[in-house]
């Protein structure tokens, strides 16, 4: 029941991040212009990652998309990037999570199958939220560089009595946005991986092998502590021997060519 | 077709308060920012205040900050100057206008003359 | 405050002749944003409210004549009447739409010889 929960919460908790990485990413308000030296601007500059805007006071805004793509900073280039991956991942991520959710039952899915989905899915989802955290963090860095040489280039070029007051951008909400979605993102897919270790099956597949000693039976075990995936924690007591060679898990074990010596 | 008729205007004392009503039709009024700007006779242009369109932004110019305030009634279609402490240099034909993309004047009413002498 | 100056004060021409006045703003009133220069013109006729002809400093108004051009950038803006009527008669004036205070220039007035 808690894996279930677990599984259900990430999903979510996934979900509402990847549809905020993907809210971020298609958002104008990356950068906004500084207010502190005119809180009552008659026109407002906000920049996104596809187009920058301008809210003027009259009411009207007017949006330019930007045409080129050799002519952008690289920066910014590197910046889509990290978001449209981020969105691919998460997106790839959602659709096996909805697969690998053990409420869901498709055919005669195994355990073992969704396990290897929740854990993948979850995965995607870390890698995305990092894309995004890592876009964002690049663009805010941008940000701050640039605000900085533009308070210092401020008054430069004063010709006679012509000022070129730079514009100066700040953060904007798409950066809050982007940073909260992809820590969303990046905790769903840890409880994604967390209830992958619960929904893998107890034991390894390896059938028990029976030495027979002179007086009893003695089965020897050699899966005893899970090795496959790393996420088994055995916290159950297992049993070494066993009388019937049978593993714990099975009701009925049949015998192959390597069961005997 | 776009309408504003500026009223209110007249002869005031110094010191004195004077209210000008703008009342505009034709258009959608609650969608616009609306400005005063007037001119001293045989002078130039002088924007005075701007209200953008929700009413909760004001701004003026520093020759009547704290004297005067601009208001509207999206209700009655009406642009407001509430003019207090007038002063001689205050004189001049208030204009009613409408701003529009580019925060361009397109529409501007026939003016109301607003004398401070005593 | 944003300077807005015109030059010449006055000038006389003669009918059909090619006019132009300047405007010269003491910041740039280019938006980083979209890119457009916020300068407006606007004609004044004798005993009438002034007329938009231009806003975003070269975008004419609808009904305004097409011998009228709005040009520059930044901080130089240009109004020119390439060929001048009789009912161009008026005061000119270009405004900063940029920031607040919007500020008028002083005018130019255009008379015919």
């Known amino acids: 029941m808690a894996v279930t929960a677990c599984q259900g919460l990430g999903f979510v908790v996934s979900l509402i991040g990847i549809a905020g990485i993907i809210a971020a990413t298609c958002m104008d308000q990356w950068s906004t212009q500084d207010l502190y030296n005119n809180p009552v601007t008659a026109v407002f500059n906000y920049q996104g990652l596809w187009r920058s805007c301008v809210r003027e006071s009259s009411g009207f805004t007017e949006c330019r998309g930007y045409f080129t793509l050799l002519g952008l900073p690289a920066m910014l280039q590197a910046v889509r990037a990290l978001m449209i991956v981020g969105i691919v991942l998460g997106a790839i991520g959602l659709l096996v999570s909805i697969f690998a959710l053990k409420c869901i039952r498709i055919g005669s899915m195994e355990d073992s199958a969704k396990a290897n989905m929740t854990l993948t899915s979850g995965i995607m989802f870390i890698v995305s939220g990092l894309c995004a955290i890592a876009g964002v963090s690049v663009f805010a860095n941008m940000l701050v560089t640039n605000f900085w040489m533009s308070t210092a280039n401020m008054y430069t070029g004063m010709g006679g009595m012509v000022q070129t007051v730079q514009t100066r951008y700040t953060f904007g909400a798409a950066l809050f946005v982007g940073w909260v979605a992809g820590g969303l993102t990046l905790i769903g897919g840890v409880m994604m991986c967390i209830a992958c270790r619960g929904l893998a099956p107890e034991e390894t597949n390896y059938k028990a092998v029976s030495y027979h000693a002179s007086g009893h039976s003695v089965a020897y075990k050699p899966g005893g502590f899970k090795a496959s995936t790393g996420f088994g924690s055995n916290t159950k007591n297992k049993k070494i021997y066993d009388g019937g060679a049978r593993t714990e898990d099975e009701v009925q074990s049949y015998p192959s060519k390597h069961d005997y010596v | 077709e776009v309408q504003l008729l500026e009223s209110g205007g007249g002869l005031v004392q110094p010191g004195g308060s004077l209210r000008l009503s703008c009342a505009a039709s034709g258009f959608t009024f609650s969608s616009y920012t609306m400005s005063w700007v007037r001119q001293a006779p045989g002078k130039g242009l002088e924007w005075v205040a701007t209200i953008i369109i929700g009413g909760s932004y004001t701004y003026y110019a520093d020759s009547v900050k704290g004297r005067f305030t601009i208001s509207r009634d999206n209700s009655k279609n009406t642009l407001y100057l509430q003019m207090n402490s007038l002063r001689a240099e205050d004189t001049a034909v208030y204009y009613c206008t409408r701003l529009v993309k580019g925060q361009a004047m397109d529409y501007w009413g026939q003016g109301t003359l607003v004398t401070v002498s005593s | 405050d944003i300077v807005m100056t015109q030059s010449p004060d006055s000038l006389a021409v003669s009918l059909g002749e090619r006019v132009t006045m300047n405007c010269k703003s003491s910041q740039s009133l280019l938006s980083s944003g979209n890119q457009k220069n916020y300068l407006s013109w606007y004609q004044q006729k004798p005993g009438q409210p002034p007329k938009l002809l231009f806003y975003w400093a070269s975008t004419r108004e609808s009904g305004v004549p097409d011998r009228f051009s709005g040009s520059g950038s930044g901080t130089d803006f240009t109004l020119t009447i390439s060929s001048v009527q009789a009912e161009d008669v008026a005061v000119y004036y270009c405004?900063?739409?940029?920031?607040?205070?919007?500020?008028f220039g002083q005018g130019t007035k255009l008379e015919i010889k």
């Open positions: 405004q900063n739409d940029y920031s607040y205070p919007f500020t």
